[in-house]
Interface confidence: low
C-alpha cells in the first residue's frame, strides 16, 4: 500500500488530525520536500542578521549580515564583525596586525609576510599591515651595485617571542 502522505507536495504537510489530507503549511512555516508530516518554522533574520530571501511555503528564509559584518558558518549561521584592512578580529575586537604580518581583507586573520629569501629572491617592495611584500629577482640577478631592501623580520608566531 502506498503511503497517502507521499502525495503531499512541497509547501504542504500530511495532516494526521485531518485523515492524512494534504494541508498547506501555516504562515511562517515551509516544507521543501513532498511527503512531510510537519512544516518547519521559517528562520527569522533578526538583529545583526538581515533577510536576503523571504521564506516561502516551499523554502526557508535566507539571511545575510548587516553592513559592518560578514557571514560565517553554513547558511550564514553567524555574523562576524568586519575589521579594516591591516587588522584582525580578536575576542577583544579589531586589532592591528603585528609587525611582519598583513591582512588585505576586512575579515580573516593576519598572515605572515612572504619570506622572499626562501625562494632565493629579494624584497622588491616592503610589506605593510595591509599588503604582503613583493618579491623581486634573486640577488644574483640584480646588476652590480644594485641594493636590495632588507627582508622583513619573521612574523610573530605561537612559540616565538619578539624580544
Amino acid at each position: 500500500l502506498q503511503d497517502p502522505c507521499s502525495n503531499c507536495p512541497a509547501g504542504t504537510f500530511c495532516d494526521n488530525n485531518r485523515n492524512q489530507i494534504c494541508s498547506p503549511c501555516p504562515p511562517n512555516s515551509f516544507s521543501s520536500a513532498g511527503g512531510q508530516r510537519t512544516c518547519d518554522i521559517c528562520r527569522q533574520c533578526k538583529g545583526v542578521f538581515r533577510t536576503r530571501k523571504e521564506c516561502s511555503s516551499t523554502s526557508n528564509a535566507e539571511c545575510d549580515c548587516t553592513p559592518g559584518f560578514h557571514c560565517l558558518g553554513a547558511g550564514c549561521s553567524m555574523c562576524e564583525q568586519d575589521c579594516k584592512q591591516g587588522q584582525e578580529l580578536t575576542k577583544k575586537g579589531c586589532k592591528d596586525c603585528c609587525f611582519g604580518t598583513f591582512n588585505d581583507q576586512k575579515r580573516g586573520i593576519c598572515r605572515p609576510w612572504t619570506n622572499c629569501s626562501l625562494d632565493g629572491k629579494s624584497v622588491l617592495v616592503n610589506g605593510t599591515k595591509e599588503r604582503d611584500v613583493v618579491c623581486g629577482p634573486s640577488p644574483a640577478d640584480l646588476s652590480p651595485g644594485a641594493s636590495s631592501v632588507t627582508p622583513p623580520a619573521p612574523a610573530r608566531e605561537p612559540g616565538h617571542s619578539p624580544q
Epitope: 560565517l72 553567524m78 584582525e88 578580529l89 580578536t90 575576542k91 612559540g159 617571542s161 624580544q163
Partner: antibody, heavy 118, light 108 residues
Framework: EVQLLESGGGLVQPGGSLRLSCAAS????????MSWVRQAPGKGLEWVSD????????DYADSVKGRFTISRDNSKNTLYLQMNSLRAEDTAVYYC???????????WGQGTLVTVSS | EIVLTQSPGTLSLSPGERATLSCRAS???????LAWYQQKPGQAPRLLIY???SRATGIPDRFSGSGSGTDFTLTISRLEPEDFAVYYC?????????FGQGTKVEIK
C-alpha cells in the same frame, strides 16, 4: 627563553583574600595580552580572566566577576590576580599564560595552588 | 557561551596506533580561533595546534588538526610513548574563552 613564574598561592579560609603574581621574562611583556587559567583538582581547564597590553581592558569569567581583579605592572613585567571573597570552588591550580588572542595561549607558567578551606 | 564537547572521554590505544580526537562546538566557530593543548600529569598545558590546523613551534608533524564550523579533529598519526596525556580544545572566538572537558589518551 620565555618564562612565566607564578607565586602567591596557599591555603586560605572561605571569604578570605589572596593575591597571585606572575613574573614574566624572555619576551616583551608590554606587547602581549595575558590571561589567568585555572584547573580544579582532577578537573579540566577554566579560563578566569585576561588583560590587554596596556592594562586598560579586562575581562572575567562569570564565576569570578566582581570578586577577582586582574592587573599588570609593565615596568616590573608582572601580572597579578587579586582574589577576594574566596569560595571552596575557587580551589585550583592557577596558571598565568601569554595570550596570543586568536592563536590561543602559547606559554604557560608552572601554576600555583590555591586551596580555600576552613 | 560556546560549549566545546570533546569525545571520547578516554581513548585506550597502543603506541604506533592512530588517535582521532573530536571537539564539537555548540555554535559555529571560525577555524582561526580553535586551538588544541596537551597536558601531562603535574605539568602545565602545552599549545599543539592553533587556527584549527597550524602546528605550534616545535610540535612534531605526527600531530595534525582539521575541521571547521562546529566540528574539529585532532589526529595523532602514530602514537609515541610521550603522547599519552590529556588533550583539550579551546576557542578564543568569543567571551568567555572556553575549553573542552578533555580527552584522555591512555596506554591500552
Amino acid at each position: 627563553e620565555v618564562q612565566l613564574l607564578e607565586s602567591g598561592g596557599g591555603l586560605v579560609q572561605p571569604g578570605g583574600s589572596l593575591r597571585l603574581s606572575c613574573a614574566a621574562s624572555g619576551f616583551t611583556f608590554s606587547s602581549y595580552d595575558m590571561s589567568w587559567v585555572r584547573q580544579a583538582p582532577g578537573k579540566g581547564l577554566e579560563w578566569v580572566s585576561d588583560i590587554d597590553p596596556t592594562g586598560s581592558k579586562t575581562d572575567y569569567a562569570d564565576s569570578v566577576k566582581g570578586r577577582f581583579t586582574i592587573s599588570r605592572d609593565n615596568s616590573k613585567n608582572t601580572l597579578y590576580l587579586q582574589m577576594n571573597s574566596l569560595r571552596a570552588e575557587d580551589t585550583a591550580v592557577y596558571y598565568c599564560a601569554r595570550d596570543l588572542m586568536v592563536y590561543g595561549f602559547d606559554y604557560w607558567g608552572q601554576g600555583t595552588l590555591v586551596t580555600v578551606s576552613s | 557561551e560556546i560549549v566545546l564537547t570533546q569525545s571520547p572521554g578516554t581513548l585506550s590505544l597502543s603506541p604506533g596506533e592512530r588517535a582521532t580526537l573530536s571537539c564539537r562546538a555548540s555554535q559555529s566557530v571560525s577555524s582561526s580561533y580553535l586551538a588544541w593543548y596537551q597536558q601531562k600529569p603535574g605539568q602545565a598545558p602545552r599549545l599543539l595546534i592553533y587556527g584549527a590546523s597550524s602546528r605550534a613551534t616545535g610540535i612534531p608533524d605526527r600531530f595534525s588538526g582539521s575541521g571547521s564550523g562546529t566540528d574539529f579533529t585532532l589526529t595523532i598519526s602514530r602514537l609515541e610513548p610521550e603522547d599519552f596525556a590529556v588533550y583539550y580544545c579551546q576557542q578564543s572566538y568569543s567571551y568567555p574563552v572556553t575549553f573542552g572537558q578533555g580527552t584522555k589518551v591512555e596506554i591500552k
